[in-house]
Interface confidence: low
């Protein structure tokens, strides 16, 4: 068991919350069965443990949000994986019932008599994780507590399901929605031929589910669907790769429902296989915007188009977080790892020095440099200050006229806050409206992004478009600069004057070859011939019959 | 230093077999890119043969070498090219090359070549 | 197969001078080719790959250019050592394939 997943991030309160995140890469393959976790996480871990201390700063410093009440949290680390996960989510479980079993706080001993530490207080809720998989796994447990779970990332439709997952919410909307986005984008560009693949696990599988549903209705074929890990090895994505290379040159669009790293994983193919410039990928909110995915493998990436959720970056929390240094910050019990990985040196005298590192830290290094704030940072945000306005709702109703926690509230009774938590109602972070339906989601608004060479060996993402309640907006020039780019992904041209479809036994109905109507037969639908009845002959355009007009032969008439 | 250097070249009789060994120095072919096969006939340009792909193994022919001609890794750095049914078309100097894509990113080491001569 | 074709089998310029080099590829290869000089007794050695990219320790004077069928490699401030045959190489990812262009001799006067 590796000891870095044992380090938790402490504040103290009268209300804990407990928060998941991947302060960790997912063990590889190899290290799952001993579930040791891969390397810090800026974004999507240093990030949302910073978010989610300064959150509770902000929150606690405000007088109209939860007066007299101290909200504090304990977070640990999910490293993107669910047996990790559970393991951390079992240790939030055990301080809950300690907690339950010692009012008082005096813990009983094996032996019968009592010790004089006071225990923990319990979770009241948990934030998080990013991951749908994770999330699922980690409510199957928090549920049977009666611990609502509020997630800022986990998109999966199957989460929508209450009977299912009762304690689970979410401040962004169901994969369903991002599902119909990209099937709009692919109608957009007549596409009607292209690949699949999706991550293996919840997310991916759902998303692609849905994916491949929507697309039937919608007349698109795909030529075949593919399914990775995102911890695969290099073989499996060369393999993967070359699947995908036999569907061209038709297929040359690949929707991806991927988490980031498959989509990483297939560009690090891309490039052992010198085939940049293949496909045009089309990827989910894994991918959105993010740097590390694309970092080092932009021309495999250029062109890709995908779905970002829209969430305008907080300025801040930049203001906080860019001033971070680890001399002084030391209630993120991993920001000297962090420091130490982000800036590939060593922090000399530090308890966390990592003498793998030659190059000493020096004090002028700064966060600022390359700063990319976490695309879904709104999200976090958001998904905290749900749980403390749910908890200020629950705090007016249950102590009316009482600054601070009263009788009534303790100990906070999960199924009353779970039913304050559905009935929140805010203005979020970026001035949008957060609330939640009756399943516990979010509305669905996306961005569309666009990765383009901007200049010679730049490359960034653009915003090409978006999607906000099925209605689809982008800017066709900004895509392709002239039509005769549009990529074409079809399997088979549309069949000329007088000319049948002709589709293959086994065949996708997007596939089929074109076989002209025998002499006297008209194009009777676009898949059959029909013979013109005696006495008529098809029409100039092939669509129908016309009577041959009759002539009458005459004695003097010269042979025809 | 990686350096790649080809060997087996020589004469031999129309109808004949050959096997050319391409070994590298500083080169482990256990790693992620291709090794290849390009000749050269005489005062003449330059022609493709084969890749294989380290990572799994898999082999890329052009058309005409299909089914005369096999690429394979025999050990951790050492390539080889049969070449059967031989005839006096088949002169050539071959080149052993490797690249980080099949053709796409170009091939970026390359023996000094191994003539091979065929004639009765 | 891919047929990659190039013109002119041949040409002269002055150091200082600028040669273009052109490769048709009779399919698009979107940006799947690379470039390689070659001197007599010598392999060749790689110059550009993807269309436009400087393969390490290429001078600047080297320029790759075009996407799809239409390819062009320029070679500006003519030096005595550019003396050489140039050769393109086409690669077609859905079949897998290459093909080498038949050859460009470079004369410096």
């Known amino acids: 068991q590796s000891s870095e997943r044992r380090v938790v991030a402490h504040m103290p309160g009268d209300i804990i919350i407990g928060a998941l995140f991947s302060v960790h890469h997912q063990p590889t393959v190899d290290k799952v069965h001993e579930r040791k976790c891969g390397a810090v996480r800026e974004q999507y871990g240093i990030q949302r443990v910073e978010a989610m201390l300064h959150t509770l700063e902000r929150i606690n410093s405000d007088p109209t949000l939860l007066p007299n009440i101290t909200l504090g949290c304990e977070i640990r680390d999910s490293c993107w994986h669910s047996a990790v996960a559970l393991e951390q989510s079992i240790e939030f479980i055990r301080d809950s019932l300690i907690s339950s079993e010692e009012e008082e706080g005096l813990v009983r001993c094996v032996d019968g008599s009592s010790s004089s530490f006071r225990s923990k207080k319990p979770i009241v809720g948990v934030i998080g994780p990013g991951s749908s998989s994770v999330a699922i796994q980690v409510q199957n447990l928090l549920q049977l507590f009666n611990i609502p779970q509020i997630a800022y990332s986990a998109t999966s439709m199957d989460l929508s399901d209450k009977t299912l997952f009762k304690y689970f919410m979410r401040v962004v909307p169901s994969d369903a929605q991002q599902a119909r986005a990209m099937v709009d984008i692919v109608k957009r560009y007549n596409w009607t031929y292209v690949s699949a693949v999706h991550t293996e696990g919840n997310y991916g599988e759902s998303g692609m589910e849905a994916f491949k549903d929507m697309s039937a209705k919608e007349g698109i074929c795909i030529a075949h669907s593919y399914k990775i890990y995102s911890n695969a090895g290099e073989q499996s994505f060369d393999k993967l790769l070359k699947k995908l290379t036999s569907h061209l040159p038709k297929a040359r669009v690949v929707a991806c429902f991927c988490e980031g790293m498959t989509v990483r994983g297939l560009l690090m193919a891309m490039r052992r296989l010198g085939l940049a410039g293949e496909f045009l990928l089309l990827g989910s909110d894994g991918w959105a915007d993010r740097y590390d995915v694309t970092d080092g493998y932009q021309r495999e990436a250029v062109g890709g188009i995908t779905i970002k959720l829209q969430s305008p970056d907080v300025k801040w929390f930049d203001d906080y977080y860019l001033k971070l240094r680890p001399e002084t910050n030391h209630r993120n019990p991993w920001f000297q790892e962090f420091w130490q990985h982000r800036f590939q040196c060593r922090l000399e005298g530090f308890p966390q020095e990592n003498s793998k590192y030659n190059k000493t830290c020096n004090s002028s290094l700064t966060l600022k440099t390359h700063h990319v704030q976490d695309s879904k940072m709104g999200f976090v945000i958001n998904a905290i200050y749900s749980m403390a306005y749910g908890l200020h709702n629950m705090q007016m109703s249950l102590c009316p006229g009482y600054a601070g926690l009263c009788d009534a509230m303790k100990p906070i009774d999960g199924r009353k806050l779970l039913e304050s938590l559905m009935k929140t109602n805010f203005t979020g972070v970026s001035g949008d409206t957060i609330l939640f339906d009756e399943n516990g989601d979010s509305p669905g608004r996306y961005e569309i992004m666009n990765f383009k060479e901007m200049g010679k060996d730049y490359f960034d993402y653009i915003n090409v478009g978006s999607w906000d309640n099925g209605e689809l907006k982008m800017d066709d020039d900004e895509v392709w600069s002239k039509k005769s780019n549009i990529i074409r992904s079809v399997c088979s041209e549309p069949c000329e004057k007088g000319q049948i479809k002709v589709i293959r036994k086994g065949e996708v109905s997007c596939c089929w070859t074109c076989t002209p109507c025998k002499e006297n037969e008209y194009v009777f639908d676009e898949y059959t011939c029909k013979a013109c009845q005696l006495g008529s002959w098809p029409t100039d355009d092939l669509t129908g019959c016309d009577l041959i007009p009759v002539q009458y032969l005459r004695w003097g008439d010269p042979e025809p | 230093q990686q350096q790649l250097e080809e060997s087996g070249g020589g004469l031999v009789k129309p109808g004949g077999t050959l096997t050319l060994t391409c070994k590298g120095s500083?080169?482990?072919?256990?790693?992620?890119?291709?090794m290849c096969w390009v000749r050269q006939a005489p005062g003449k340009g330059l022609e493709w043969i084969a890749c294989?792909?380290?990572?799994?193994?898999?082999t890329y022919y052009a058309n005409w070498a299909k089914g005369r001609f096999t690429i394979s890794k025999t050990s951790s750095t050492t390539v080889t090219l049969q070449m059967t049914s031989l005839t006096a078309a088949d002169t050539a100097t071959y080149f052993c090359?490797?690249?980080?894509?099949?053709?796409?990113?170009?091939?970026?080491?390359w023996g000094p070549g191994t003539l091979v001569t065929v004639s009765s | 197969d891919i047929v990659m074709t190039q013109t002119p089998a041949s040409v002269e310029a002055a150091v200082g001078g600028t040669v273009t080099i052109k490769c048709q590829a009779s399919e698009s290869i979107y940006s799947n080719l690379a470039w390689y000089q070659q001197k007599p007794g010598q392999p060749p050695k790689l110059l550009i790959y993807?269309?436009?990219n400087l393969a390490s320790g290429v001078p600047s004077r080297f320029k790759g250019s075009g996407s799809g069928t239409e390819f062009t490699l320029t070679i500006s401030d003519l030096e005595c050592a550019d003396a050489a045959t140039y050769y393109c190489?086409?690669?077609?990812?859905?079949?897998?394939?290459?093909?080498f262009g038949g050859g460009t001799e470079v004369v410096v006067k």
């Open positions: 294989i792909y380290n990572g799994d193994g898999e």
């Open positions: 993807r269309a436009s």
């Open positions: 190489q086409g690669y077609y990812a859905s079949t897998v394939t290459n093909a």
């Open positions: 500083g080169i482990d072919f256990n790693d992620y890119y291709y």
């Open positions: 090359a490797r690249g980080s894509g099949v053709g796409s990113y170009g091939y970026n080491f």
